[in-house]
Amino acid sequence: LSVQQGPNLLQVRQGSQATLVCQVDQATAWERLRVKWTKDGAILCQPYITNGSLSLGVCGPQGRLSWQAPSHLTLQLDPVSLNHSGAYVCWAAVEIPELEEAEGNITRLFVDPDDPTQNRNRIASFPG
C-alpha cells in the first residue's frame, strides 16, 4: 500500500476553497479501505471505502470528502477560515483482505486573511 499526498504547500485566501488530494495505490484489490485525515495531529474524520463508496462525506469543519476511482481521495475545504491553517496528513489502511497501512507526507495549509491589514499584522507578529 502506498499513499501520495499533495500539494506539499497550499496558500489560500480566507473564504475561498482549498483542495487536498491523497492518492492511494495498492498492487492487489481491496474490499475495505479505512482512510483518515488529521490536522495538526487531531483526527478530522476516519471513514472507510467499500463497494466504491465512502461511508462519510463530511470531514471536519466545512470539509467535504470524495473518492474518485481508482485512487484519489479528495478533501475539499469550502469556505476556508483562518483556523483551517495547519498541517494535514492523509492515512490509509486496507482492512480487508489483510491489514496494511501507509500515510502521506504533510500538506501545510496557510490561510491569508481577507483583510490585507490583518495579513500585515499577522506577518509582523512572527519573531525575527
Partner: antibody, heavy 120, light 113 residues
Framework: QVQLQESGPGLVKPSQTLSLTCTVS??????????WSWIRQFPGKRLEWMGY???????SYNPSLKSRVTISRDTSKNQFSLKLSSVTAADTATYCC????????????WGQGTMVTVSS | DIVMTQSPDSLAVSLGERATINCKSS????????????LNWYQQKPGQSPKLLIY???TRLSGVPDRFSGSGSGTDFTLTISSLQAEDVADYYC?????????FGDGTKLEIK
C-alpha cells in the same frame, strides 16, 4: 534504469535447500510502494509466482509452496534472496526475480533468469 | 487460488491477419472500489523473460505497438493482435493481481501459418 540479476548454483541435490540472490542496480529496494518477487518457469513453460518481499520487509508467499519458501533482503547490498527447502526434481525450473509497484501493478522489470536443476 | 485458463494452447495465424487469445478467470477480477480489472498480458520470446503488453485488462504499456489491444471485464478477457507481424511470434500469458497468490495462465503459443 533498474536492472535485476539472479545468481546462485545451477545444480542442487534433492532434499537440499536452493538458494538464489537477486542483485538490484539503479534503484533502491527500500523505495516505498515497490515489491520484489521471485517467479519460476518450469520446463513446460508454466509460470509460478513464488512470493515477494516489499519495501518495508514484509513478505507474502504462494501457499502452494507451503513453508518451504523464504524471501529475505539485504538493503546494504541492495539484494533480495530466495531459499527453497527440501527440493525435488519437480523444482527444476528457470528462476527469475522481478519487480512490481503499488501504482502500476505488473511485473515491469525482470531478471534474465537462472536455470536450476535438481538432481543427484 | 484464482485459476487462469487460457485458450487456445497454440495458434497459427497468417501474416497480416488477426490473432485472438482468450483468458478466463475462476472468479471476477473487477473491483468496484477502483473500477479496475486486475489482469495483465505478457509476451515472451524464446530465450527472454516475459514482457508486459497490457495492464488493467485494456491499458497498453507505453511503447507497445497499437496492433495489440486488450478487452474484457470480470472473468473473461481477450488479447487481440489486429495484424500479425513476424516479430509477434511468441508465447503469451495472462496474469491476475487481484489477490495473492498471483497466478498466470498456462500460455498460448502463437506461430505464423
Amino acid at each position: 534504469q533498474v536492472q535485476l540479476q539472479e545468481s546462485g548454483p545451477g545444480l542442487v541435490k534433492p532434499s537440499q535447500t536452493l538458494s538464489l540472490t537477486c542483485t538490484v542496480s539503479g534503484f533502491s529496494i527500500s523505495t516505498s510502494g515497490y515489491y520484489w518477487s521471485w517467479i519460476r518457469q518450469f520446463p513446460g513453460k508454466r509460470l509460478e509466482w513464488m512470493g515477494y518481499i516489499n519495501y518495508g520487509g514484509g513478505t507474502s508467499y504462494n501457499p502452494s509452496l507451503k513453508s518451504r519458501v523464504t524471501i529475505s533482503r539485504d538493503t546494504s547490498k541492495n539484494q533480495f534472496s530466495l531459499k527453497l527447502s527440501s527440493v525435488t526434481a519437480a523444482d527444476t525450473a528457470t528462476y527469475c526475480c522481478a519487480t512490481m509497484a503499488d501504482r502500476f501493478a505488473f511485473f515491469d522489470v525482470w531478471g534474465q533468469g537462472t536455470m536450476v536443476t535438481v538432481s543427484s | 487460488d484464482i485459476v487462469m485458463t487460457q485458450s487456445p494452447d497454440s495458434l497459427a495465424v497468417s501474416l497480416g491477419e488477426r490473432a485472438t487469445i482468450n483468458c478466463k478467470s475462476s472468479q471476477s477480477l473487477f473491483s468496484s472500489n477502483t473500477n479496475r480489472n486486475y489482469l495483465n498480458w505478457y509476451q515472451q520470446k524464446p530465450g527472454q523473460s516475459p514482457k508486459l503488453l497490457i495492464y488493467h485488462a485494456s491499458t497498453r504499456l507505453s511503447g507497445v505497438p497499437d496492433r495489440f489491444s486488450g478487452s474484457g471485464s470480470g472473468t473473461d478477457f481477450t488479447l487481440t493482435i489486429s495484424s500479425l507481424q513476424a516479430e509477434d511470434v511468441a508465447d503469451y500469458y495472462c496474469q491476475h493481481h487481484y489477490e495473492t497468490p498471483l497466478t498466470f495462465g498456462d500460455g498460448t503459443k502463437l506461430e505464423i501459418k
